[in-house]
C-alpha cells in the first residue's frame, strides 16, 4: 500500500468539471440579536445578515432562520468569528477575595444539523476561559475547517452567552462557508 | 421559492472553466516595519515580504507599497495573523492602584480600498483587550473570510500599534489571499 | 511592466483542468496523546485520528505516524486549532510574590519536512503568553494559511507542551489541509 501512496489517480478523467464561479458560497455578518427561547443546557444560535453590506449568499446557498442550507454535497470550508465583550468577570472579583474559582468562559460552536443523524453534530468549537482584570474586556474567537457535507445539511453558530456577542460591526462577528 | 432551494443550477453549463493553477494567489510574510506617516485616527498599514522565504505572489496578484492588488474580479479567501508582543500593559499597573480603567487593546483590520467606493472598507477586524499581569506578553490575532472583490481593489492590513507587532519570524505574522 | 499588470493571462488555455472532487484533502481530529520521546529543544508532534468521526483523508492524501503526506505539488491551504487547558500558571503565583517573571506560554507550530531541505520548516506559529489568574484556564490557538508544497512533503503539528492539549473532543483540536 505504501508504495502506491503517490501513484496517479485515474479518477479525475471521469470526474465532472465545473466552473468555480457557480459554487455555493456565503458570508454572513452579525446583526443585533433578539432574545429567543432556547433549551436549557443548549447554547443559543445566532442569526445573521445575509444580503446587506459585506454579506452575501450565492449559487443556491440559502440562509433561513439562523441556518445556512447546504444545496449540494461536497467538501466545504466553514468559518466563523465571534467577538465577545463584557464587564469584569466574576472570576477576578472572587480572586480578589482570595478564593480559588472556576473561571467564566466564552464558547463558539459551529453545529451541523443533518437528516441522516438525529442529534446535531458539533463541527468546530472554540472555548476560552475569561478571567480578566480590567473593567471591560473584549476578544474574538475564530474557527475554520473543512468538512464533508450532504445536500440538505444545515449549519448554525451557537454561543455560550448571546448577550456578550459584539453585534456592532459586520467585520467583528461573521460566519461563512464555501464549496471547495 | 422554498421548493426550488435545492434545484440544480443550469448556470454551470455556460460558466467558463479554468485551471486552478493559474488563479491569483499570495502569501506575504512580516518584515521589520519602518515608521511611516499615517493619517490621524487611522491605523497604520503593515508592509510585507512578497518573494523571499515562504512568501510569494503569483498569477498577476501583485504586491506594492503595503497593498495586495486584485487582478481579477471574483470571490477571494483573505487571511492574516498578526502576533503582538509588549511589556506589561498600563492596565494592570492602574488596576494595582485600585482605579477602574479602560483596558489597553490590540487590533488588526484587513481593509479594502476600492474605486467603486470612496472610503476604505473594513472587511475583517480582530480586536482584543490586553490587561496582562506578567511582565511580558505576546499573543496572535487571526482573521480569515471570503469576500467578493473587484479587479483593481487593493487590500492592506492595519494594526492599532505598529511597534507591538512581532516581526521576528515569517510564521508568526502573515497576510494572504487567493481566488476561490 | 506596470501596464501589463491586469492584462489577461493566456496561461489558462494550456493549464490542465481537473475536477475539484479529486483533489487531495484531509481533516484530522485530536486523539489522546501517548507520551513519546522527543528531542530536547524540539516541540513534540501531535498524532491524530484520520478516519473516525469528522476525520477523513481522501484522494491520495495520507496520514501516517503524525504526518500528513502531500501526494502532489501545488498550493495548499493548511490549518490547525489546538485547544490548551491547564491549572493556574506559575506566572501568577510568582507575580503574587512580587517578583517579575517571564510568563509561561503555549505554542502551536505547523511544520513541513521536505526531502529538498535538511531542516524542518516552520510554516505557521501561534504563540501566546499564559499568565492566568483563575485556578483553571483553557483557550484555543488557531492557524491557517496557504503554502506551495511539493509532492512528498510531510506536515505535522508541534506543540510546546503535549500535556496541556485538550484531547477530549474532536471539534476542539484538529488539523487539516486541502489542495487549492
Amino acid at each position: 500500500l505504501k508504495g502506491q501512496e503517490f501513484a496517479p489517480s485515474h479518477q479525475q478523467v471521469y470526474a465532472p468539471l465545473r466552473a468555480d464561479g457557480d459554487k455555493p458560497r456565503a458570508h454572513l455578518t452579525v446583526v443585533r440579536q433578539t432574545p429567543t427561547q432556547h433549551f436549557k443546557n443548549q447554547f443559543p444560535a445566532l442569526h445573521w445578515e445575509h444580503e446587506l453590506g459585506l454579506a452575501f449568499t450565492k449559487n443556491r446557498m440559502n440562509y433561513t432562520n439562523k441556518f445556512l442550507l447546504i444545496p449540494e454535497s461536497g467538501d466545504y470550508f466553514i468559518y466563523s468569528q465571534v467577538t465577545f465583550r463584557g464587564m469584569t468577570s466574576e472570576c477576578s472579583e472572587i480572586r480578589q477575595a482570595g478564593r480559588p474559582n472556576k473561571p467564566d468562559s466564552i464558547t463558539v460552536v459551529i453545529t451541523k444539523v443533518t437528516d441522516s443523524y438525529p442529534e446535531p453534530t458539533q463541527l468546530l468549537m472554540g472555548t476560552k476561559s475569561v478571567c480578566e482584570v480590567g473593567s471591560n474586556w473584549f476578544q474574538p474567537i475564530y474557527l475554520g475547517a473543512m468538512f464533508s457535507l450532504q445536500e440538505g445539511d444545515k449549519l448554525m453558530v451557537n454561543v455560550s452567552d448571546i448577550s456578550l456577542v459584539d453585534y456592532t460591526k459586520e467585520d467583528k462577528t461573521f460566519f461563512g462557508a464555501f464549496l471547495l | 421559492l422554498k421548493g426550488q432551494e435545492f434545484a440544480p443550477s443550469h448556470q454551470q453549463v455556460y460558466a467558463p472553466l479554468r485551471a486552478d493553477g493559474d488563479k491569483p494567489r499570495a502569501h506575504l510574510t512580516v518584515v521589520r516595519q519602518t515608521p511611516t506617516q499615517h493619517f490621524k485616527n487611522q491605523f497604520p498599514a503593515l508592509h510585507w515580504e512578497h518573494e523571499l522565504g515562504l512568501a510569494f505572489t503569483k498569477n498577476r496578484m501583485n504586491y506594492t507599497n503595503k497593498f495586495l492588488l486584485i487582478p481579477e474580479s471574483g470571490d477571494y479567501f483573505i487571511y492574516s495573523q498578526v502576533t503582538f508582543r509588549g511589556m506589561t500593559s498600563e492596565c494592570s499597573e492602574i488596576r494595582q492602584a485600585g482605579r477602574p480603567n479602560k483596558p489597553d487593546s490590540i487590533t488588526v483590520v484587513i481593509t479594502k480600498v476600492t474605486d467603486s467606493y470612496p472610503e476604505p472598507t473594513q472587511l475583517l477586524m480582530g480586536t482584543k483587550s490586553v490587561c496582562e499581569v506578567g511582565s511580558n506578553w505576546f499573543q496572535p490575532i487571526y482573521l480569515g473570510a471570503m469576500f467578493s472583490l473587484q479587479e483593481g481593489d487593493k487590500l492592506m492590513v492595519n494594526v492599532s500599534d505598529i511597534s507591538l507587532v512581532d516581526y521576528t519570524k515569517e510564521d508568526k505574522t502573515f497576510f494572504g489571499a487567493f481566488l476561490l | 511592466l506596470k501596464g501589463q499588470e491586469f492584462a489577461p493571462s493566456h496561461q489558462q488555455v494550456y493549464a490542465p483542468l481537473r475536477a475539484d472532487g479529486d483533489k487531495p484533502r484531509a481533516h484530522l481530529t485530536v486523539v489522546r496523546q501517548t507520551p513519546t520521546q522527543h528531542f530536547k529543544n524540539q516541540f513534540p508532534a501531535l498524532h491524530w485520528e484520520h478516519e473516525l468521526g469528522l476525520a477523513f483523508t481522501k484522494n491520495r492524501m495520507n496520514y501516517t505516524n503524525k504526518f500528513l503526506l502531500i501526494p502532489e505539488s501545488g498550493d495548499y491551504f493548511i490549518y490547525s486549532q489546538v485547544t490548551f487547558r491547564g491549572m493556574t500558571s506559575e506566572c501568577s503565583e510568582i507575580r503574587q510574590a512580587g517578583r517579575p517573571n517571564k510568563p509561561d506560554s503555549i505554542t502551536v507550530v505547523i511544520t513541513k519536512v521536505t526531502d529538498s531541505y535538511p531542516e524542518p520548516t516552520q510554516l505557521l506559529m501561534g504563540t501566546k503568553s499564559v499568565c492566568e489568574v483563575g485556578s483553571n484556564w483553557f483557550q484555543p490557538i488557531y492557524l491557517g494559511a496557504m503554502f506551495s508544497l511539493q509532492e512528498g512533503d510531510k506536515l505535522m503539528v508541534n506543540v510546546s507542551d503535549i500535556s496541556l492539549v485538550d484531547y477530549t473532543k474532536e471539534d476542539k483540536t484538529f488539523f487539516g489541509a486541502f489542495l487549492l
Partner: antibody, heavy 116, light 106 residues
Framework: QVQLVQSGAEVKKPGASVKLSCKAS????????MHWVRQAPGQGLEWMGR????????KYDPKFQVRVTMTTDTSTSTVYMELSSLRSEDTAVYYC?????????WGQGTTVTVSS | EIVLTQSPGTLSLSPGERATLSCRAS?????MYWYQQKPGQAPRPWIY???NLASGVPDRFSGSGSGTDYTLTISRLEPEDFAVYYC?????????FGGGTKLEIK
C-alpha cells in the same frame, strides 16, 4: 494637511495636447485612487477616469479612452492627465480628486481654454 | 453607462423651508454620493454612501434611497445651503454624475 494642488491655467489651439498636474500632500497617493473630472462652462460634472498610483492601472470613460492618458510619479506624489487632439468643446475646468481615503478631496481646478 | 437624472433642475425655496432633491438611476446602484458646488468653487463632498454626511456637513442634511431612487433632504434651509447639488454613482464604469439641481432663494 490633506490637499491637492493643481497646475495653472492653459490656453491651447485645436489639435494640440495638454498635460495637467495634480500634486498631493498630507497623504500617500498610493493609498488611494486619483480621478479627473471636468466641468464645461455653465455645465455639469463629467468623470473622465481614474488611476491607481500604486499599480499604474487606469480606468477611463470610453468617450475619452483614445485621447486621455493618466500617469503618476509617486516620488513627487503627483498625478498627470494628458488630453490630446483638443477641440473647442474641451474648454472646461479640470479637477483632480481622490477616492479610497477618507475624506474625499478635490483640487482647486485648472482652466483649459481651447481656441484658435 | 448608468444615467443619473436629477429633479427638479431648479428648486426655488425660502430659508426655513424643507427641500427634497431627487436622483434617479437608469439601473440599480449600490450607493449614491452627493456633492455641493458654489459658483467659482470646486465641488465639495456632501453625502457619501447614500446616507453618511461628510465632515462638517450640518445634520439638517440627510440622504436616503436604494436601488434606482435616491433623495437628498434638507429639513430646514439656511442661507448657506443655496447651491448646486450633484449626485454621482460609483457602481458602474464609467462613473457618472447627474445633471445637477440648482437650489435657489425664492
Amino acid at each position: 494637511q490633506v490637499q491637492l494642488v493643481q497646475s495653472g491655467a492653459e490656453v491651447k489651439k485645436p489639435g494640440a495636447s495638454v498635460k495637467l498636474s495634480c500634486k498631493a500632500s498630507g497623504f500617500d497617493i498610493q493609498d488611494t485612487y486619483m480621478h479627473w473630472v471636468r466641468q464645461a462652462p455653465g455645465q455639469g460634472l463629467e468623470w473622465m477616469g481614474r488611476i491607481d498610483p500604486a499599480s499604474g492601472h487606469t480606468k477611463y470613460d470610453p468617450k475619452f479612452q483614445v485621447r486621455v492618458t493618466m500617469t503618476t510619479d509617486t516620488s513627487t506624489s503627483t498625478v498627470y492627465m494628458e488630453l490630446s487632439s483638443l477641440r473647442s468643446e474641451d474648454t472646461a475646468v479640470y479637477y483632480c480628486s481622490r477616492s479610497g481615503g477618507l475624506p474625499d478631496v478635490w483640487g482647486q481646478g485648472t482652466t483649459v481654454t481651447v481656441s484658435s | 453607462e448608468i444615467v443619473l437624472t436629477q429633479s427638479p433642475g431648479t428648486l426655488s425655496l425660502s430659508p426655513g423651508e424643507r427641500a427634497t432633491l431627487s436622483c434617479r438611476a437608469s439601473s440599480s446602484v449600490s450607493y449614491m454620493y452627493w456633492y455641493q458646488q458654489k459658483p467659482g468653487q470646486a465641488p465639495r463632498p456632501w453625502i457619501y454612501a447614500t446616507s453618511n454626511l461628510a465632515s462638517g456637513v450640518p445634520d439638517r442634511f440627510s440622504g436616503s434611497g436604494s436601488g434606482t431612487d435616491y433623495t437628498l433632504t434638507i429639513s430646514r434651509l439656511e442661507p448657506e445651503d443655496f447651491a448646486v447639488y450633484y449626485c454621482q454613482q460609483w457602481s458602474g464604469n464609467p462613473r457618472t454624475f447627474g445633471g445637477g439641481t440648482k437650489l435657489e432663494i425664492k
